[in-house]
Protein backbone atom coordinates (compact mmCIF):
# COMPACT_ATOMS: atom_id res chain seq x y z
CA UNK A 1 0.00 0.00 0.00
CA UNK A 2 1.11 3.54 -0.68
CA UNK A 3 0.87 6.04 2.16
CA UNK A 4 1.38 9.81 2.18
CA UNK A 5 -0.45 12.81 0.84
CA UNK A 6 -1.81 12.66 -2.71
CA UNK A 7 -2.65 15.47 -5.14
CA UNK A 8 -4.42 14.96 -8.47
CA UNK A 9 -4.81 18.03 -10.70
CA UNK A 10 -6.16 18.13 -14.24
CA UNK A 11 -6.90 20.85 -16.79
CA UNK A 12 -8.88 20.86 -20.04
CA UNK A 13 -7.44 22.77 -23.00
CA UNK A 14 -11.04 23.51 -24.16
CA UNK A 15 -10.84 21.21 -27.20
CA UNK A 16 -9.52 17.63 -27.12
CA UNK A 17 -6.89 17.34 -24.39
CA UNK A 18 -7.00 16.86 -20.62
CA UNK A 19 -3.58 17.13 -18.96
CA UNK A 20 -3.16 15.61 -15.51
CA UNK A 21 -0.49 15.64 -12.80
CA UNK A 22 -0.59 13.22 -9.88
CA UNK A 23 1.77 13.59 -6.94
CA UNK A 24 2.05 11.11 -4.11
CA UNK A 25 4.52 11.32 -1.24
CA UNK A 26 6.15 7.98 -0.68
CA UNK A 27 5.02 6.43 -3.95
CA UNK A 28 7.33 4.00 -5.71
CA UNK A 29 8.94 5.54 -8.80
CA UNK A 30 8.62 2.36 -10.88
CA UNK A 31 4.91 1.84 -10.15
CA UNK A 32 2.80 1.56 -13.31
CA UNK A 33 -0.10 4.01 -13.13
CA UNK A 34 -2.74 5.34 -15.52
CA UNK A 35 -5.40 8.01 -15.64
CA UNK A 36 -8.83 6.73 -16.72
CA UNK A 37 -11.45 9.16 -18.03
CA UNK A 38 -15.16 8.23 -17.92
CA UNK A 39 -17.49 10.97 -19.21
CA UNK A 40 -21.02 10.93 -17.84
CA UNK A 41 -22.79 11.59 -21.13
CA UNK A 42 -20.41 10.24 -23.75
CA UNK A 43 -19.96 6.68 -24.97
CA UNK A 44 -16.18 6.87 -25.08
CA UNK A 45 -13.54 6.38 -22.39
CA UNK A 46 -9.87 7.29 -22.49
CA UNK A 47 -6.68 6.25 -20.74
CA UNK A 48 -3.16 7.61 -20.57
CA UNK A 49 0.00 6.27 -18.98
CA UNK A 50 1.36 8.40 -16.14
CA UNK A 51 5.06 9.12 -16.65
CA UNK A 52 7.40 10.46 -13.94
CA UNK A 53 8.21 14.17 -14.09
CA UNK A 54 9.93 14.43 -10.70
CA UNK A 55 10.71 12.33 -7.65
CA UNK A 56 7.09 12.08 -6.51
CA UNK A 57 4.93 13.30 -9.38
CA UNK A 58 3.66 11.87 -12.65
CA UNK A 59 1.93 13.45 -15.65
CA UNK A 60 0.02 12.43 -18.74
CA UNK A 61 -2.20 13.79 -21.50
CA UNK A 62 -5.60 12.34 -22.33
CA UNK A 63 -5.90 12.77 -26.10
CA UNK A 64 -9.64 12.91 -26.83
CA UNK A 65 -9.47 13.57 -30.58
CA UNK A 66 -7.87 15.82 -33.15
CA UNK A 67 -6.54 19.09 -31.70
CA UNK A 68 -9.38 21.21 -33.11
CA UNK A 69 -12.35 18.95 -32.29
CA UNK A 70 -14.80 19.99 -29.58
CA UNK A 71 -14.91 16.82 -27.48
CA UNK A 72 -16.46 18.19 -24.28
CA UNK A 73 -18.89 20.95 -23.33
CA UNK A 74 -19.79 22.92 -20.21
CA UNK A 75 -22.43 20.34 -19.23
CA UNK A 76 -20.06 17.36 -19.33
CA UNK A 77 -18.68 15.81 -16.16
CA UNK A 78 -15.76 13.41 -16.52
CA UNK A 79 -14.84 10.99 -13.75
CA UNK A 80 -11.05 10.86 -13.63
CA UNK A 81 -9.32 8.07 -11.75
CA UNK A 82 -5.66 7.32 -11.04
CA UNK A 83 -5.20 3.55 -11.22
CA UNK A 84 -1.94 1.87 -10.23
CA UNK A 85 -0.95 -1.73 -10.80
CA UNK A 86 -0.37 -3.86 -7.71
CA UNK A 87 0.64 -7.29 -8.90
CA UNK A 88 -2.14 -8.51 -11.19
CA UNK A 89 -4.70 -6.03 -9.86
CA UNK A 90 -5.33 -2.32 -10.35
CA UNK A 91 -5.80 -0.13 -7.29
CA UNK A 92 -7.57 3.24 -7.38
CA UNK A 93 -5.30 5.91 -5.90
CA UNK A 94 -7.29 9.10 -6.62
CA UNK A 95 -10.61 10.11 -8.11
CA UNK A 96 -12.33 13.35 -9.06
CA UNK A 97 -15.49 14.42 -10.83
CA UNK A 98 -13.97 16.79 -13.33
CA UNK A 99 -15.95 19.66 -14.84
CA UNK A 100 -13.92 20.56 -17.92
CA UNK A 101 -15.07 24.15 -18.32
CA UNK A 102 -14.39 24.87 -14.63
CA UNK A 103 -10.78 23.65 -15.00
CA UNK A 104 -9.42 25.29 -18.12
CA UNK A 105 -5.84 25.88 -19.17
CA UNK A 106 -5.42 26.80 -22.80
CA UNK A 107 -2.43 26.07 -24.99
CA UNK A 108 0.24 28.76 -25.12
CA UNK A 109 -0.28 31.42 -27.80
CA UNK A 110 1.56 30.74 -31.05
CA UNK A 111 2.76 32.49 -34.21
CA UNK A 112 4.24 35.52 -32.44
CA UNK A 113 5.58 38.03 -34.93
CA UNK A 114 6.80 41.58 -35.13
CA UNK A 115 4.33 43.58 -37.19
CA UNK A 116 6.25 46.86 -37.05
CA UNK A 117 9.27 48.06 -35.14
CA UNK A 118 10.65 51.58 -34.60
CA UNK A 119 13.24 53.13 -32.32
CA UNK A 120 11.01 53.37 -29.24
CA UNK A 121 8.09 51.07 -30.01
CA UNK A 122 7.24 47.67 -31.40
CA UNK A 123 3.91 46.21 -32.54
CA UNK A 124 3.60 42.45 -31.97
CA UNK A 125 0.81 40.04 -32.88
CA UNK A 126 0.04 36.41 -31.96
CA UNK A 127 -2.60 33.71 -32.36
CA UNK A 128 -4.42 31.55 -29.87
CA UNK A 129 -4.15 27.80 -30.39
CA UNK A 130 -6.85 25.13 -29.98
CA UNK A 131 -9.21 27.45 -28.10
CA UNK A 132 -12.90 26.61 -28.12
CA UNK A 133 -15.25 28.80 -30.12
CA UNK A 134 -17.47 28.75 -27.01
CA UNK A 135 -15.36 31.52 -25.51
CA UNK A 136 -16.19 33.93 -28.33
CA UNK A 137 -14.33 37.02 -27.12
CA UNK A 138 -14.24 36.14 -23.42
CA UNK A 139 -10.48 35.80 -23.08
CA UNK A 140 -7.77 37.86 -21.43
CA UNK A 141 -4.02 38.02 -21.97
CA UNK A 142 -0.90 38.80 -19.98
CA UNK A 143 2.31 39.89 -21.66
CA UNK A 144 5.83 40.64 -20.50
CA UNK A 145 8.96 42.06 -22.08
CA UNK A 146 12.49 41.03 -21.14
CA UNK A 147 14.88 43.98 -21.06
CA UNK A 148 18.68 43.65 -21.09
CA UNK A 149 20.14 42.88 -17.68
CA UNK A 150 16.83 41.68 -16.22
CA UNK A 151 15.12 38.31 -15.66
CA UNK A 152 11.65 37.25 -16.76
CA UNK A 153 10.57 37.27 -13.13
CA UNK A 154 11.46 40.96 -12.89
CA UNK A 155 9.53 41.89 -16.02
CA UNK A 156 6.33 43.85 -15.26
CA UNK A 157 3.11 42.19 -16.40
CA UNK A 158 0.90 43.93 -18.95
CA UNK A 159 -2.76 42.88 -18.82
CA UNK A 160 -5.10 42.89 -21.80
CA UNK A 161 -8.61 42.49 -20.45
CA UNK A 162 -10.14 41.52 -23.79
CA UNK A 163 -9.49 39.23 -26.75
CA UNK A 164 -6.79 41.36 -28.35
CA UNK A 165 -4.17 39.40 -30.24
CA UNK A 166 -1.68 42.23 -30.60
CA UNK A 167 0.14 44.78 -28.47
CA UNK A 168 2.07 47.97 -29.06
CA UNK A 169 5.10 48.16 -26.76
CA UNK A 170 6.23 51.71 -26.13
CA UNK A 171 9.01 53.61 -24.32
CA UNK A 172 11.58 51.13 -25.58
CA UNK A 173 15.29 51.97 -25.90
CA UNK A 174 16.69 52.38 -29.43
CA UNK A 175 18.99 49.71 -30.86
CA UNK A 176 18.24 47.30 -28.02
CA UNK A 177 17.53 43.58 -28.01
CA UNK A 178 14.31 42.53 -26.25
CA UNK A 179 12.27 39.38 -25.80
CA UNK A 180 8.49 39.16 -25.52
CA UNK A 181 6.07 36.53 -24.18
CA UNK A 182 2.29 36.30 -23.86
CA UNK A 183 -0.19 33.95 -22.19
CA UNK A 184 -3.96 33.57 -22.31
CA UNK A 185 -6.79 32.74 -19.91
CA UNK A 186 -10.53 32.29 -20.45
CA UNK A 187 -12.79 34.27 -18.13
CA UNK A 188 -14.84 31.12 -17.53
CA UNK A 189 -14.15 28.54 -14.82
CA UNK A 190 -13.69 28.56 -11.07
CA UNK A 191 -10.33 26.75 -11.23
CA UNK A 192 -9.21 28.05 -14.62
CA UNK A 193 -5.58 29.11 -14.79
CA UNK A 194 -3.22 30.88 -17.17
CA UNK A 195 -1.83 29.03 -20.18
CA UNK A 196 1.90 28.43 -20.28
CA UNK A 197 3.91 31.37 -21.56
CA UNK A 198 4.43 31.46 -25.31
CA UNK A 199 7.81 30.78 -26.82
CA UNK A 200 9.81 34.04 -26.47
CA UNK A 201 9.91 36.33 -29.48
CA UNK A 202 13.22 38.15 -29.86
CA UNK A 203 13.30 41.55 -31.53
CA UNK A 204 15.57 44.58 -31.76
CA UNK A 205 14.50 48.22 -31.84
CA UNK A 206 15.85 50.40 -34.61
CA UNK A 207 18.86 52.61 -33.89
CA UNK A 208 18.18 56.29 -33.30
CA UNK A 209 18.91 58.39 -36.36
CA UNK A 210 22.22 60.27 -36.17
CA UNK A 211 21.84 63.87 -35.07
CA UNK A 212 18.49 63.23 -33.36
CA UNK A 213 17.79 62.56 -29.69
Amino acid sequence: AVNGTSRFTCFYNSRANISCVWSQDGALQDTSCQVHAWPDRRRWNQTCELLPVSQASWACNLILGTPDSQKLTAVDIVTLRVMCREGVRWRMMAIQDFKPFENLRLMAPISLQVVHVETHRCNISWKISQASHYFERHLEFEARTLSPGHTWEEAPLMTLKQKQEWICLETLTPDTQYEFQVRVKPLQGEFTTWSPWSQPLAFRTKPAALGKD
Epitope: W44, G65, T66, P67, D68, S69, Q70, K71
Partner: nanobody, 116 residues
Framework: QVQLQESGGGLVQAGGSLRLSCVAS????????MAWYRQGADNQRVLVAA???????AYGDSVKGRFTISRQNARNTVYLQMNSLKPEDTAVYYC??????????WGQGTQVTVSS
Protein backbone atom coordinates in the same frame (compact mmCIF):
# COMPACT_ATOMS: atom_id res chain seq x y z
CA GLN B 1 -29.06 14.43 -36.92
CA VAL B 2 -26.13 12.56 -38.45
CA GLN B 3 -26.24 8.88 -39.41
CA LEU B 4 -23.05 6.81 -39.71
CA GLN B 5 -22.69 3.45 -41.45
CA GLU B 6 -19.54 1.34 -41.06
CA SER B 7 -18.30 -1.44 -43.32
CA GLY B 8 -15.17 -3.49 -43.95
CA GLY B 9 -14.88 -5.52 -40.77
CA GLY B 10 -14.22 -9.25 -40.75
CA LEU B 11 -11.87 -12.06 -39.80
CA VAL B 12 -8.19 -11.72 -40.67
CA GLN B 13 -4.96 -13.50 -39.81
CA ALA B 14 -2.40 -11.81 -37.56
CA GLY B 15 -0.10 -9.64 -39.68
CA GLY B 16 -2.86 -9.05 -42.21
CA SER B 17 -4.69 -5.89 -43.24
CA LEU B 18 -8.22 -4.54 -43.32
CA ARG B 19 -9.74 -1.28 -44.47
CA LEU B 20 -12.78 0.09 -42.66
CA SER B 21 -15.10 2.66 -44.21
CA CYS B 22 -17.69 4.92 -42.65
CA VAL B 23 -20.22 6.95 -44.62
CA ALA B 24 -21.99 9.91 -42.98
CA SER B 25 -25.44 11.08 -44.04
CA UNK B 26 -27.97 13.57 -42.75
CA UNK B 27 -26.78 16.91 -41.34
CA UNK B 28 -23.21 16.41 -42.52
CA UNK B 29 -22.46 20.15 -42.57
CA UNK B 30 -22.48 20.09 -38.75
CA UNK B 31 -19.64 17.53 -38.61
CA UNK B 32 -16.21 18.66 -37.48
CA UNK B 33 -14.03 15.72 -36.43
CA MET B 34 -14.51 12.08 -37.40
CA ALA B 35 -12.94 9.18 -35.59
CA TRP B 36 -12.71 5.46 -35.07
CA TYR B 37 -13.10 3.98 -31.59
CA ARG B 38 -12.93 0.35 -30.57
CA GLN B 39 -14.55 -1.62 -27.79
CA GLY B 40 -12.85 -4.84 -26.74
CA ALA B 41 -13.44 -7.42 -24.04
CA ASP B 42 -12.95 -4.82 -21.28
CA ASN B 43 -16.01 -2.93 -22.61
CA GLN B 44 -14.14 0.38 -22.78
CA ARG B 45 -14.66 2.39 -25.96
CA VAL B 46 -11.31 4.03 -26.65
CA LEU B 47 -9.97 6.27 -29.40
CA VAL B 48 -8.15 4.50 -32.22
CA ALA B 49 -7.70 7.38 -34.65
CA ALA B 50 -9.32 10.72 -35.42
CA UNK B 51 -9.23 13.19 -38.29
CA UNK B 52 -10.44 16.78 -38.51
CA UNK B 53 -12.20 18.46 -41.41
CA UNK B 54 -8.88 19.93 -42.56
CA UNK B 55 -6.96 16.67 -42.18
CA UNK B 56 -5.28 16.93 -38.77
CA UNK B 57 -4.95 13.46 -37.27
CA ALA B 58 -4.56 11.87 -33.84
CA TYR B 59 -3.83 8.22 -33.01
CA GLY B 60 -4.05 5.99 -29.97
CA ASP B 61 -0.63 4.85 -28.76
CA SER B 62 -1.29 1.17 -29.49
CA VAL B 63 -1.93 1.70 -33.24
CA LYS B 64 0.60 4.40 -34.16
CA GLY B 65 2.60 3.41 -37.23
CA ARG B 66 0.21 0.56 -38.11
CA PHE B 67 -3.15 2.29 -38.69
CA THR B 68 -3.86 5.25 -40.96
CA ILE B 69 -7.02 7.35 -40.91
CA SER B 70 -8.09 9.33 -43.97
CA ARG B 71 -11.14 11.30 -45.03
CA GLN B 72 -12.93 12.23 -48.24
CA ASN B 73 -15.05 15.25 -47.38
CA ALA B 74 -16.74 15.26 -50.79
CA ARG B 75 -18.01 11.73 -50.15
CA ASN B 76 -18.63 12.30 -46.41
CA THR B 77 -16.52 9.21 -45.81
CA VAL B 78 -13.75 8.34 -43.36
CA TYR B 79 -11.45 5.33 -43.74
CA LEU B 80 -9.24 3.34 -41.40
CA GLN B 81 -6.44 1.39 -43.02
CA MET B 82 -5.27 -1.25 -40.54
CA ASN B 83 -1.95 -2.99 -41.26
CA SER B 84 0.14 -5.48 -39.26
CA LEU B 85 -2.95 -6.51 -37.32
CA LYS B 86 -2.50 -8.25 -33.96
CA PRO B 87 -4.88 -10.45 -31.95
CA GLU B 88 -5.21 -7.60 -29.42
CA ASP B 89 -6.76 -5.46 -32.17
CA THR B 90 -9.83 -7.70 -32.01
CA ALA B 91 -12.80 -5.48 -31.11
CA VAL B 92 -15.95 -3.86 -32.37
CA TYR B 93 -14.89 -0.74 -34.27
CA TYR B 94 -17.22 2.25 -34.09
CA CYS B 95 -17.30 5.27 -36.35
CA UNK B 96 -17.77 8.58 -34.53
CA UNK B 97 -18.50 12.12 -35.66
CA UNK B 98 -18.43 15.19 -33.47
CA UNK B 99 -20.22 18.41 -34.30
CA UNK B 100 -19.07 21.99 -33.89
CA UNK B 101 -21.48 22.13 -30.96
CA UNK B 102 -19.81 19.21 -29.18
CA UNK B 103 -22.45 16.56 -29.94
CA UNK B 104 -21.37 12.97 -30.61
CA UNK B 105 -22.81 10.67 -33.26
CA TRP B 106 -22.08 6.95 -33.53
CA GLY B 107 -22.41 4.13 -36.02
CA GLN B 108 -23.61 0.65 -35.13
CA GLY B 109 -20.11 -0.83 -35.16
CA THR B 110 -18.28 -3.41 -37.25
CA GLN B 111 -16.57 -6.49 -35.80
CA VAL B 112 -12.86 -7.00 -36.47
CA THR B 113 -11.42 -10.36 -35.40
CA VAL B 114 -7.70 -11.08 -35.69
CA SER B 115 -6.77 -14.73 -35.30
CA SER B 116 -3.32 -15.95 -34.38
Amino acid sequence: QVQLQESGGGLVQAGGSLRLSCVASGSVSSINGMAWYRQGADNQRVLVAAISRVGNTAYGDSVKGRFTISRQNARNTVYLQMNSLKPEDTAVYYCNADSWGGDDYWGQGTQVTVSS
